[in-house]
């Protein structure tokens, strides 16, 4: 659900930690429409998701650890 | 301790529909997903779909869409499971069971089921 | 969807056996499986998470490996009390899909 690197909506299935290499941020006041974390996945696939979720907000703390461990 | 019970055996007519409560105790309701897994007579389990406390997210398997309603009470840490639109293939035990982010997204207590039958 | 296919579906086996039931996945999971034990009347348990992690209160007779698509439940020396149906899970992605389950009989 991205549109020149924006994501327009969120996708409405729940990714394992397992599954997903990183994420960035994208702001809805830096020229997209919504917030949204862009997970992206071991397969190279970029998925949008909501940031208000309680899983999404799970993972990106897992993997923030992760960054500040190395 | 941990513990999910869940109403009593329920029969009811093609066309009805069904409403099934899973009460938790013992930990902090809001803080783990609950999820719903049937079996049906004769057939493996399978999972029908998820709802977060914390936040009344709803995840579904895609076959119970429009079938399912999820719903939770959290002033009575109590999660529902509602059925509609009955037919015989509903006839299954359902279960309500906890996911646990921390179990590798397992499902580590489970309540004890209850039957639903739909017979005319 | 990702399919998970477990064989074999029945087992017969004597106390003492070692048994090893087998689960695959239709694409790579990456350790992202859990398995589950059921007897009949009661409702499933949690057995092993994370494809190799043995769940709270599960004795050490049981072990999970495998990694991609393929993945082992292994019981080293079966008891009595072992004799259920045995279920793997997919938890990469939703729907979180489950095999058809391998029953496991006395000989």
């Known amino acids: 659900a991205s549109n020149f690197d924006c994501c327009l909506g969120y996708t409405d299935r729940i990714l394992h930690p397992k599954f997903i290499v990183g994420f960035t941020r994208q702001l809805a006041n830096e020229g997209c429409d919504i917030n949204a974390i862009i997970f992206h996945t071991k397969k190279k696939l970029s998925v949008c998701a909501n940031p208000k979720q309680t899983w999404v907000k799970y993972i990106v703390r897992l993997l923030s650890k992760k960054v500040k461990n190395m | 301790q941990v513990q999910l019970v869940q109403s009593g055996a329920e029969v009811k007519k093609p066309g009805a529909s069904v409403k099934v409560s899973c009460k938790a105790s013992?930990?902090?309701?809001?803080?783990?997903?609950m999820h719903w897994v049937r079996q049906a007579p004769g057939q493996g389990l399978e999972w029908m779909g998820l709802i977060d406390p914390s936040d009344k997210y709803t995840n579904y398997n895609q076959k119970f869409k429009g079938k399912a309603t999820l719903t939770v009470d959290t002033s009575t840490s109590t999660a529902y499971m509602e059925l509609s639109s009955l037919r015989s293939e509903d006839t299954a035990v359902y279960y309500c069971t906890r996911g646990n982010y921390g179990v590798d997204y397992g499902m580590d207590y489970w309540g004890q089921g209850t039957l639903v039958t739909v017979s005319s | 969807d990702i399919q998970m296919t477990q064989s074999p579906s029945s087992l017969s086996a004597s106390v003492g056996d070692r048994v090893t039931i087998t689960c695959g996945a239709s694409?790579?999971?990456?350790?992202?499986l859990n398995w589950y034990q059921r007897k009949p009347g009661k409702a499933p348990k949690l057995l092993i998470y994370?494809?190799?992690n043995l769940a709270d209160g599960v004795p050490s007779r049981f072990s999970g490996s495998g990694s991609g698509r393929d993945y082992t439940l292994t019981i080293s020396s079966l008891q009595p009390e072992d004799f259920a149906t045995y279920y793997c899970q997919n938890v990469l992605i939703t729907p979180y899909t489950f095999g058809q389950g391998t029953k496991l009989e006395i000989k």
């Open positions: 013992g930990y902090t309701f809001t803080s783990y997903w």
């Open positions: 694409e790579n999971i990456y350790g992202a």
């Open positions: 994370g494809a190799t």
